[in-house]
Amino acid sequence: SRVDQEERFPQGLWTGVAMRSCPEEQYWDPLLGTCMSCKTICNHQSQRTCAAFCRSLSCRKEQGKFYDHLLRDCISCASICGQHPKQCAYFCENKLRSPVNLPPEL
């Protein structure tokens, strides 16, 4: 809702006329009058609307880790395989299929 957006993101989204809500991975650029990808500003001072996204982007570059939005931190997949979220599926399933666990070839 607009109230929700206003309370959560009081900076950076105000156009002077109305709040503009953007998708999760974008921020409102008042000069351009449009939603912009957070990727473009992750290397600079982060907009508050992009802070979590930029952290998740840098986290995804680390193998075997995922960005947990509930904890707002980078978490190791290795510590939670078995009850892992989908972001860890590739890591955890590969771990299960590692050569140690594979049956000998016929």
Epitope: R48, A51, H69
Partner: antibody, heavy 123, light 107 residues
Framework: EVQLQQSGPELVKPGASVKISCKTS????????MHWVQQSHGKSLEWIGG????????SYNQKFKGKATLTVDKSSSTAYMELRSLTSEDSAVYYC????????????????WGQGTSVTVSS | SIVMTQTPKFLLVSVGDSITITCKAS??????VVWYQQKPGQSPKLLIY???NRYTGVPDRFTGSGYGTDFTFTITTVQAEDLAVYFC?????????FGGGTKLEIK
């Protein structure tokens, strides 16, 4: 009504371990992360770590890595913190506090806290 | 790690006075600052989130402001029941850090 009910005070010997519980009610346990905060006597608050109840993934303050271990029991909506190799430095009040999803719930920081569990380490 | 420097440590005021507490972050934390009140023998209670938003049920004599590195918390017309320790906390990046606290005492 949201409630976080912590276990009672603990008096433990140096070198021992202690496990504190935080039983929650009045909200959906898996929609909020659970955090633990230390308050040494007459001092400020220090964040120990947090846990995502959905999968048990946890995030720690570097200072408490190896000292604290966070776990949850989803079936009873209870969070636990185990402290090991206790010394007099660990004597403090420990609080659990819930925190909402940054995107899901309207995000309110640590909005509900337990009443605190006093841990005294003494021989 | 971000460090939150809170001043002053103590405040001695009379009922009806106004007080201001400041918190300085060691690097920009956008508006991700939270203020808590801890009354004697109680657990902390959330007062202000996102630097300036009052939490549900918090009287309007409590206000917060700031952005980036400098934040202020004000109580206009202090009441006897405001006797407590007040803490700021940065909620921008882990590890989440608290200020050292300000003990408000009533004359």
């Amino acid at each position: 009504e949201v409630q976080l009910q912590q276990s009672g005070p603990e008096l433990v010997k140096p070198g021992a371990s202690v496990k504190i519980s935080c039983k929650t009610s009045g909200y959906t346990f898996t929609e909020f992360s659970m955090h633990w905060v230390q308050q040494s006597h007459g001092k400020s608050l220090e964040w120990i770590g947090g846990i995502n109840p959905n999968h048990g993934g946890s995030s720690y303050n570097q200072k408490f890595k190896g000292k604290a271990t966070l776990t949850v029991d989803k079936s009873s909506s209870t969070a636990y913190m185990e402290l090991r190799s206790l010394t007099s430095e660990d004597s403090a009040v420990y609080y659990c506090a819930r925190r909402g999803d940054y995107y899901g719930n309207l995000y309110y920081a640590m909005d509900y806290w337990g009443q605190g569990t006093s841990v005294t380490v003494s021989s | 790690s971000i460090v939150m420097t809170q001043t002053p440590k103590f405040l001695l005021v009379s009922v009806g006075d106004s007080i201001t507490i400041t918190c300085k972050a060691s690097q920009s934390v956008s508006n991700d600052v939270v203020w808590y009140q801890q009354k004697p023998g109680q657990s902390p209670k959330l007062l202000i989130y996102y630097a300036s938003n009052r939490y549900t049920g918090v009287p309007d004599r409590f206000t917060g402001s700031g952005y980036g590195t400098d934040f202020t918390f004000t109580i206009t017309t202090v009441q006897a029941e405001d006797l407590a320790v007040y803490f700021c906390q940065q909620d921008y990046s882990s590890p989440w850090a608290f200020g050292g606290g300000t003990k408000l005492e009533i004359k």
